[in-house]
Interface confidence: low
Amino acid sequence: EEELQVIQPEKSVSVAAGDSATLNCTVSSLIPVGPIQWFRGAGPGRELIYNLKEGHFPRVTPVSDPTKRNNMDFSIRISNITPADAGTYYCVKFRKGSPDVELKSGAGTELSVRAKPSAPVVSGPAVRATAEHTVSFTCESHGFSPRDITLKWFKNGNELSDVQTNVDPAGKSVSYSIRSTARVVLTRRDVHSQVICEVAHVTLQGDPLRGTANLSEAIRVPPFLEVTQQSMRADNQVNVTCQVTKFYPQRLQLTWLENGNVSRTEMASALPENKDGTYNWTSWLLVNVSAHRDDVKLTCQVEHDGQPAVNKSFSVKVSAHPKEQGSNTAAENTGTNERNIY
């Protein structure tokens, strides 16, 4: 008499989350009499998946009619698969008795569940950095299975190489997460730059998911300062200009000091953008030369994006201009608040 064989032809089956999985099992003989049961896992902790005779298994249905005479096909279909269903399933033959005795197990079929990764979320540095500095961007995606996944970083369409990626856990799990960090060296031209995290997975059928971050959130472009004197006006007033150029972000405060004393403070707002995303700003101060006996030291002081103030000074030569007799008043501030003349 030939020994009973329990045949599970597939070593592994891969199913998309939400689909049905068919687990095949046939027996080589109708003898001895006894039921077939399906389990997930082996050993004492195994989980009963299907038992024709008793129990309620709403998601499991037999592929063929198990009640028909001479049935030797005990394949099952599990509906609405989730990542939690992953594991190795065993078709086990029992000999009828009180209780039934386990006789033979199939070799097992590994069910892996294909679950889509979540949309990648890209986060940048907590504080801004200036050009030539390196900043890190992090990309995370979760809930995918199987574990195989590809993640690439791009900056303005060019793939980045300074990347470190981890998929967790390393061991068996119903689903996985990926976390990747890309290091990007900033340049002054990066205000309009973008980094993209691209995730490719078998469940996405060649259409990768993308997460993006704008380098404008990570970069600070400090301003250039230039202070110049316009020609003397007929009314003995000198127009001094402070040009603040190529800065980002817009958050900027400008203070004029005359001989160290605050003359006027202005805040930048509603500035038009340069092509590269930076901003320019021009501020004027009118100095009444006739009101001063000595040269006037004018300082343009700029505080940009909460950084320490940057100063640029200029001396107006009073000695070169005739003075009004008996005048000892402070320099008259008639400076306008006009901005951004290009």
Epitope: S12, S112, P146, R147, D148, T150, A170, G171, K172
Partner: antibody, heavy 121, light 107 residues
Framework: EVQVLESGGGLVQPGGSLRLSCAAS????????MSWVRQAPGKGLEWVSA????????HYADSVKGRFTISRDNSKNTLYLQMNSLRAEDTAVYYC??????????????WGQGTTVTVSS | EIVMTQSPATLSVSPGERATLSCRAS??????LAWYQQKSGQAPRLLIY???TRATGIPARFSGSGSGTEFTLTISSLQSEDFAGYYC?????????FGQGTKLEIK
């Protein structure tokens, strides 16, 4: 019959290179992660490297990182281990093994008989 | 990397008796642990995966237990073919690492 068969071992001088191959048969090669494990004479097992079923993910032991490269050709059902800058301590029997899934879980349930690599001047 | 430590290095047991082999991880590896048997001159054979699940074709006298950092392989009634080397291996963190092995010999 499910089996894997290693080849490519031999005697090589320190600093030299060698490429090991592992031919698989009897199973859907691309569905299974593969690994190289070595065993120095009289010593225990040392995990060397692993590659996922698709080949998109690879991992290495610290002792071989930067010197060894694992790869696979699923169209030829073959696994490779390119070994460069070989050292005397790389002398061992190198086993090819298949994981029981495509993603490194469960352990390695199919093993070859091994190929011997000797690094000596 | 995670260091796996097996004890004892050598275990002498009589046929028919129970053998208990231990494996300790330097940090938690959850249940991601496998046991292998290796006979002299042969390739290793997978016995247990997932810390406690027997691989296909492995006799019921082999059982694994434990999780986290402490694991045990028990052979309930030793047969002559069971005298061999035994290795644990964690597959929770890269790089995967083996224990140094336990040699099971006839007493």
């Amino acid at each position: 019959e499910v089996q894997v068969l290693e080849s490519g071992g031999g005697l090589v001088q320190p600093g030299g290179s060698l490429r090991l191959s592992c031919a698989a048969s009897g199973f859907t090669f691309s569905s299974y992660a593969m690994s190289w494990v070595r065993q120095a004479p009289g010593k225990g097992l040392e995990w060397v490297s692993a590659i996922s079923g698709s080949g998109s993910s690879t991992h290495y032991a610290d002792s071989v990182k930067g010197r060894f490269t694992i790869s696979r050709d699923n169209s030829k059902n073959t696994l490779y281990l390119q070994m460069n800058s070989l050292r005397a301590e790389d002398t061992a029997v190198y086993y090819c093994a298949a994981y029981s899934g495509s993603y490194y879980y469960y352990g390695m349930d199919v093993w070859g008989q091994g190929t011997t690599v000797t690094v000596s001047s | 990397e995670i260091v796996m430590t097996q004890s004892p290095a050598t275990l002498s047991v009589s046929p028919g008796e129970r053998a208990t082999l231990s494996c300790r991880a330097s940090q938690s590896v959850s249940s991601n642990l496998a046991w292998y048997q290796q006979k002299s001159g042969q390739a290793p054979r997978l016995l247990i995966y997932g810390a406690s699940t027997r691989a296909t074709g492995i006799p019921a006298r082999f059982s694994g237990s434990g999780s986290g950092t402490e694991f045990t392989l028990t052979i309930s009634s030793l047969q002559s073919e069971d005298f061999a080397g035994y290795y644990c291996q964690q597959y929770n963190n890269w790089p995967y690492t083996f224990g140094q092995g336990t040699k099971l010999e006839i007493k």
